[in-house]
Interface confidence: low
């Protein structure tokens, strides 16, 4: 292809310096904090007779860098040190031997703001492309996680809630997911970009907040989304279902065993008593179920322990309306095991329990 035919392909900035060495790259790129960007880049250089068989090394430097003194932010030269603050985050993704200088930035940080220039070295042929330079702008993280609730939430029925950050990139440090909820929960599996929370709502969880917080540790930035739980009640005869969760709240991690109490308990023996009585008896025990982090999982995927140890069901024969009780689900300690209690009512309006003790579930 005649060289003259290539001229229309060149950007004006590329020709401004030296027509022997030219580079095509967008002059500005914007990336949100914690996220990533791939900047396409092509460069050309003549290959002298004495360097035809030499390997090509590419380097990205910060503007103002002195080649002989300063380390690059990224390079394909294996034995070359790179800047500590960009190590593992800036990558020369392109293959310089194919004239590709594409730069990948992951876990973008505020201090990545600035201009960068590319340099090639092939044997004794060395050149720094001072124009055009790449200007990187790191802005606030405005993306927020998405919480998906399949179907409706019914008291006593477990549902898998998914918190996803589909806008995050595969190459970055996997984010840390944290869930905050008053409702009985445990962790389900996770992927790089999503976390599943198994929730078993109680009537009093209606209208309470559930938060999914996502921390991009690579950049030290956090984003979250909070929703209000909408727990619906299926009209039916009042029944009580006792369905234990993982009573111990134990979860194996690489770091060891993390103990946690998620909250909500019922005792079969007390079911025959008035619900109001239960409410007042156990109110004082409530504070013993502490706000606890249930798990910090470093493995992928993460599976929370949600399998029941035993199942009991019994019918409650009693008043269908107990206004003084307002659907309270007390928490008690028994034999160091916690159980979830669920009461199904029809036509009841549960009030929020102002002393609800939240539990936090983290997954990484």
């Amino acid at each position: 292809m005649p060289l003259l035919l290539l001229l229309p392909l060149l950007w004006a900035g590329a020709l401004a310096m030296d027509p022997n060495f030219w580079l095509q790259v967008q002059e500005s790129v914007t990336v949100q904090e914690g996220l990533c960007v791939l900047v396409p880049c092509t460069f050309f250089h003549p290959i002298p007779y004495y360097d035809k068989n030499s390997p090509v090394h590419g380097y990205w430097f910060r503007e103002g860098a002195i080649i002989s003194r300063d380390s690059p932010v990224a390079t394909n030269k294996l034995d070359q040190e790179v800047q500590e603050e960009t190590q593992g985050r800036f990558r020369l993704l392109g293959d310089p031997s194919r004239n590709n200088c594409s730069l990948s930035i992951v876990d973008a940080r505020r201090r990545d703001n600035g201009s960068y220039f590319f340099r090639m070295e092939r044997g004794s042929t060395k050149y720094s492309y001072k124009s055009p330079q790449l200007s990187v702008h790191v802005t606030d993280l405005t993306h927020r996680p998405k919480i998906l609730i399949p179907g409706t939430l019914e008291p006593g029925h477990s549902k898998n809630l998914t918190c996803s950050v589909s806008w995050a990139c595969e190459q970055g440090t996997p984010p840390i997911f944290s869930w905050l909820s008053a409702a009985p929960t445990s962790l389900g599996p996770r992927t790089t970009h999503s976390s599943v929370l198994i929730i078993t709502p109680r009537p009093q969880d209606h209208g309470t907040n559930l938060t999914c917080q996502v921390k991009f540790a690579g950049a030290g930035v956090t984003t979250e989304r909070t929703i209000q739980l909408n727990v619906t009640y299926v009209p039916q005869n009042p029944t009580t279902g006792i369905f234990p969760g993982d009573g111990s709240g134990k979860q194996e991690t690489r770091a060891g065993v993390v103990h946690g109490a998620i909250g909500g308990a019922g005792v079969t023996a007390l079911l025959a008593l008035c619900l109001c009585l239960i409410f007042f008896i156990v109110k004082t025990h409530r504070r013993k179920a502490a706000r606890t982090a249930v798990g910090r999982n470093d493995t992928h995927p993460t599976t929370g322990s949600a399998s029941p140890k035993h199942q009991k069901k019994s019918k409650l024969h009693g008043p269908t309306e107990t206004s003084s009780c307002s659907g309270a689900a007390p928490t008690v300690e028994m034999d160091e095991e916690l159980h979830y209690a669920s009461l199904n009512f029809h036509g009841m309006n549960p009030s929020k329990d102002t002393s609800t003790e939240y539990s936090e579930v983290r997954t990484q």
Partner: antibody, heavy 117, light 111 residues
């Protein structure tokens, strides 16, 4: 400003050797290659070889292989070209030329070497 | 070795007229990006002076009446409007491989 200043004219007898110098100034000496090109009276340009001071790479035309040696003294920013076993047909103006990549952007003024018995 | 053949050997052109010098390489000296061919001007008693690099790029400081074109094996140096100071010998040179070689030269005179 960029300058390549060569040593003065030489008259040599056949079979002798000649060493021509080329002193560079006005830029970073080791960033460039240095070539030697000769021109016989009334004739065209003939490439002899090159040297790259920063890593000692050299390359010579086959015709001069074994007779030519190019060296460099980075402390004085000087390149040298020594041609041995001189013959009458080696009579020529010898130029040193600077090369950024592979064209010659600056040339010395030339050194006339006359080989005569 | 790559042989460069210039044509014509000598050329006489009137002032203000166009002068065209050709250079043919015995093998391809171009890639998709670059043509490794350069042009020099040499006036009597002076060293050569670089005019055009990589077939078509004008060296800085060279008047824009000089231009270069071509790829592969055939290259052209053009002087769009001949001036008196353009009287010289013109050489093409390749840098595709060792040895580097020059064309035999084209002598340009004023008609």
């Amino acid at each position: 400003q960029v300058q390549l200043v060569q040593s003065g004219a030489e008259v040599k007898k056949p079979g002798a050797s000649v060493k021509v110098s080329c002193k560079a100034s006005g830029y970073t000496f080791t960033d460039y290659n240095y070539h030697w090109v000769r021109q016989a009276p009334g004739q065209g340009l003939e490439w002899i070889g090159f040297i790259y001071p920063s890593n000692g790479i050299t390359g010579y035309a086959q015709k001069f292989q074994g007779r030519v040696t190019m060296t460099v003294d980075t402390s004085t920013s000087t390149v040298y070209m020594e041609l041995s076993s001189l013959r009458s047909e080696d009579t020529a103006v010898y130029y040193c030329a600077r090369s950024d990549v592979d064209y010659f952007d600056y040339w010395g003024q030339g050194t006339l070497v006359t080989v005569s018995s | 070795d790559i042989v460069l053949t210039q044509s014509p050997d000598s050329l006489a052109v009137s002032l203000g007229e166009r002068a065209t010098i050709n250079c043919r390489a015995s093998q391809d000296v171009s890639t998709s990006t670059y043509s490794y061919m350069h042009w020099y001007q040499q006036k009597p008693g002076q060293p050569p002076k670089l005019l055009i690099k990589y077939a078509s790029f004008l060296e800085s400081g060279v008047p824009d009446r000089f231009s270069g074109s071509g790829s592969g094996t055939d290259f052209t140096l053009t002087i769009s409007s001949l001036q008196a100071e353009d009287v010289a010998v013109y050489y093409c040179q390749h840098s595709w491989e060792i040895p580097l070689t020059f064309g035999q030269g084209t002598k340009l005179e004023i008609k």
